[in-house]
Amino acid sequence: MSVTACQGLGFVVSLIGFAGIIAATCMDQWSTQDLYNNPVTAVFNYQGLWRSCVRESSGFTECRGYFTLLGLPAMLQAVRALMIVGIVLGVIGILVSIFALKCIRIGSMDDSAKAKMTLTSGILFIISGICAIIGVSVFANMLVTNFWMSTANMYSGMGGMGGMVQTVQTRYTFGAALFVGWVAGGLTLIGGVMMCIACRGLTPDDSNFKAVSYHASGQNVAYRPGGFKASTGFGSNTRNKKIYDGGARTEDDEQSHPTKYDYV
């Protein structure tokens, strides 16, 4: 796969994943539960990071936001933070990767700069994806630990306050947002890895400039074993003759047929 294709595909995959992370963060269906065991109406409860909703069999739906931060579980706050960090890093990653794309020319930006930006965006996407995956997994773990509520508590108070609180033993299931979050986090992570791989292809290979081969022409030969010049006394008569087979060649021959000693 070419560097441009790898980089472009990594960008698109990360973009899809990033969109999924935003969608998952905004969705209400992080946890779902059917509460059929009451005599008034069948109730379907679903909860997100920002509000809790109740849908009745009549179709009526009521959602209430988590307006207080103090009463919320620390784990929920942590999940919110992780998802927001993932989104913020994703936004930065997208902005950086747009400028890093090989198919987009911006000023006199060389491949070295684009390679660094590609690597940066790749790392940002990887961290963004990891944040989303951890956030969703923490929430899922929170649901698993709350699968069965079996204790009954007695709250007593003055003036008719209080009463018996019974926990209802029903199972909460993973909502659609969890699966969206896992897939989106995975895609963002994969896209980030692809960007990092593309970065390697964009980086100029320094070794190309370290090994230089020098080719000397036949006219600049400094040493010719076994040969002798006109100064030996043979004069022009011997100019185009071979002295012996396998011996030194004349100057005319040497210009068109360099020997193995012509390289210094």
Partner: nanobody, 120 residues
């Protein structure tokens, strides 16, 4: 914690009226269903009336046409208007709410009960 405060019980003559109220307070997300149950001496607890957030209601057979349930969602309060009371309506009336109490958890909360006595 979720607390329920019931009020409105008392002594009333047959054919009279009473209005019970029950307010939920504490930390919770939603209260999908609020309702009233009653338990007469020596009898099992039975549904009087229930109401959902959307206004869906359900009444016990013995009170249909005489009792009316309503709720104020903003105040998390349920009301039971009891008209044409009969001696057989004498019982301890319990407020009952289904509370979405947190992420992945919900509670069925019962009040301590308020006594309604219908007598000459």
């Amino acid at each position: 914690q979720v607390q329920l405060q019931e009020s409105g019980g008392g002594l009333v003559q047959p054919g009279g009226s009473l209005r019970l109220s029950c307010a939920a307070s504490g930390t919770f997300f939603n209260i999908p269903v609020m309702g009233w149950y009653r338990q007469a001496p020596g009898k099992q607890r039975e549904l009087v009336a229930g109401i959902s957030t959307g206004g869906t209601t359900n009444y016990g057979d013995s009170v249909k046409g005489r009792f009316t349930i309503s709720r104020d969602n903003a105040k998390n309060t349920v009301y039971l208007q009891m008209n044409s009371l009969k001696p057989e309506d004498t019982a301890v009336y319990y407020c009952n709410v289904l509370v979405i109490s947190g992420i992945g958890s919900h509670l069925e909360v019962w009040g301590q009960g308020t006594l309604v006595t219908v007598s000459e």
